[in-house]
C-alpha cells in the first residue's frame, strides 16, 4: 500500500488530523521535501545576521553577517567580529599579533613567521604583523660570481615590540 502522504509535494505537509490531506505550510514555515508530516520553522536572520535569501514554502532562509563580521559554522550558524590584518580576535577583542607572528586576513589567528633556516634558506624580506617573512636562496645556492646577498637580520618592526 502506498503511503498517501508521499503525494504531498514540497511546500505542503500531510495533515495527521485531517485524513492525511496535503495542506500548504503556514507562513514562516517550509517543507523542502515531499511527504513530510510537519513543516519546519523558517530561520530568522536577526541581530548581527542579515537575510541573504528569504524563506519560501519549499526552502529555508539563508543568513550571512552584517559588515564587520564574517560567517562561521555550517550554514553561517555564527557571526564573528572581523579584525584588521595584523590582528586576531581574543576574548578581549581584536589584539595585534605578537612579535614573530602575522595574520594577512581580517579573520583567523596570528601564525608564526616561516623559519627559513628549516629549509636551509635565508630571510629575504622581514616579516611584519601583516605579512610572513620571504625566504630567499641560501648563500650556497648562489652561482659563482654572482653578487652575494647578505640577508638582513630579522629586525623588529617599529612599534611591534615583543609581548
Amino acid at each position: 500500500l502506498q503511503d498517501p502522504c508521499s503525494n504531498c509535494p514540497a511546500g505542503t505537509f500531510c495533515d495527521n488530523n485531517r485524513n492525511q490531506i496535503c495542506s500548504p505550510c503556514p507562513p514562516n514555515s517550509f517543507s523542502s521535501a515531499g511527504g513530510q508530516r510537519t513543516c519546519d520553522i523558517c530561520r530568522q536572520c536577526k541581530g548581527v545576521f542579515r537575510t541573504r535569501k528569504e524563506c519560501s514554502s519549499t526552502s529555508n532562509a539563508e543568513c550571512d553577517c552584517t559588515p564587520g563580521f564574517h560567517c562561521l559554522g555550517a550554514g553561517c550558524s555564527m557571526c564573528e567580529q572581523d579584525c584588521k590584518q595584523g590582528q586576531e580576535l581574543t576574548k578581549e577583542g581584536c589584539k595585534d599579533c605578537s612579535f614573530g607572528t602575522f595574520n594577512d586576513e581580517e579573520h583567523g589567528v596570528c601564525r608564526p613567521w616561516t623559519d627559513c633556516s628549516l629549509d636551509g634558506k635565508s630571510v629575504l624580506v622581514n616579516g611584519t604583523k601583516e605579512r610572513d617573512v620571504v625566504c630567499g636562496p641560501s648563500p650556497a645556492d648562489l652561482s659563482p660570481g654572482a653578487s652575494s646577498v647578505t640577508p638582513p637580520a630579522p629586525a623588529r618592526e617599529p612599534g611591534h615590540s615583543p609581548q
Epitope: 495527521n16 503556514p26 507562513p27 517543507s31 513543516c39 520553522i41 530561520r43 530568522q44
Partner: antibody, heavy 122, light 112 residues
Framework: QSVEESGGRLVTPGTPLTLTCTVS????????MTWVRQAPGKGLEYIGI??????TYYASWAKGRFTISKTSSTTLELKITSPTTEDTAIYFC??????????????????WGPGTLVTVSS | AAVLTQTPSPVSAAVGGTVTISCQAS????????LSWFQKKPGQPPKLLIY???SLASGVPSRFKGSGSGTQFTLTISDLESDDAATYYC????????????FGGGTEVVVK
C-alpha cells in the same frame, strides 16, 4: 499513544548527561516533540523542540547547553552538554499534537511523559 | 524574547466557585490564537487543558474555558472542585526559530 523519559540521575557538574524519550503508538517523523523542565520550586521552562523531519529549535538560553537528536523513529534524546547545579530539575518530553492542523508546533503538548529527575551536585 | 505574565499567585476560591486567571503576552502569539493552558500538580506531568486559545483538549471538563486573542488571554474555571487545586501555566507560540515557545510564570489555584 504514550511518552516516557529515562536517564535522569545524579551527576557532577560538567559531566555530560543524555536523557532519552521513548514514544509508543506514533512515529517521531509525524509530530513535533518538545523538551520542558521544572526546577525545584520553579515554573515550567521550555528547552527546545524537534520537527518531524528532525530539525531542532532551542530557547535562546538553552542554545549550546542542550542538544536534541532523534536516534530512531521512536526515541528522542536530550543531551545536557556540561551540566551545572542550575540544571537540577525534572525533565519532561511531550508531543505537540497540532490538533488544529497547522502543520507545525502549536503548543498543544499532549501526551507528556512522567518526567525524569536530574540532580547536578558535587 | 516575548514574556508571558500571569495573574499573581495564589488565587483562592471556594468549592463551587469560579476563578479567572489571566495571561498577558508582551507580543502577539502566532495567528493571534496559538496559546495553550496547562494544569500542573506536584509529582505529575503537566496536563493540556486548552489549545488554540479556546479549544478544549480531549477529556477535559467543560468547566474549563479559554478565551482571548493576540496578547490577552484568560482561563476560567467554574464550578470549582477540590481536585482543581494546582498551578496553571499558559504557553504562547511565537514566530521565531529561537524562543518558539514561552511559558508564563504559573498561577497557583487554592480551593477552600
Amino acid at each position: 499513544q504514550s511518552v516516557e523519559e529515562s536517564g535522569g540521575r545524579l551527576v557532577t557538574p560538567g559531566t555530560p548527561l543524555t536523557l532519552t524519550c521513548t514514544v509508543s503508538g506514533f512515529s517521531l517523523s509525524d509530530y513535533y516533540m518538545t523538551w520542558v523542565r521544572q526546577a525545584p520550586g520553579k515554573g515550567l521552562e521550555y528547552i527546545g523542540i524537534m520537527s518531524g523531519s528532525g530539525s531542532t529549535y532551542y530557547a535562546s538560553w538553552a542554545k549550546g547547553r542542550f542538544t536534541i537528536s532523534k536516534t530512531s523513529s521512536t526515541t528522542l534524546e536530550l543531551k545536557i552538554t556540561s551540566p551545572t547545579t542550575e540544571d537540577t530539575a525534572i525533565y519532561f518530553c511531550a508531543r505537540d499534537g497540532d490538533y488544529a492542523g497547522w502543520g507545525y508546533a502549536t503548543g498543544a503538548f499532549d501526551p507528556w511523559g512522567p518526567g525524569t529527575l536530574v540532580t547536578v551536585s558535587s | 524574547a516575548a514574556v508571558l505574565t500571569q495573574t499573581p499567585s495564589p488565587v483562592s476560591a471556594a468549592v463551587g466557585g469560579t476563578v479567572t486567571i489571566s495571561c498577558q503576552a508582551s507580543q502577539s502569539v502566532v495567528g493571534n490564537s496559538l496559546l495553550s493552558w496547562f494544569q500542573k500538580k506536584p509529582g505529575q506531568p503537566p496536563k493540556l487543558l486548552i489549545y488554540s486559545a479556546s479549544s478544549l483538549a480531549s477529556g477535559v471538563p467543560s468547566r474549563f474555558k479559554g478565551s482571548g486573542s493576540g496578547t490577552q488571554f484568560t482561563l476560567t474555571i467554574s464550578d470549582l472542585e477540590s481536585d482543581d487545586a494546582a498551578t496553571y501555566y499558559c504557553t504562547g507560540r511565537y514566530n521565531s526559530d529561537t524562543d518558539t515557545f514561552v511559558f508564563g510564570g504559573g498561577t497557583e489555584v487554592v480551593v477552600k
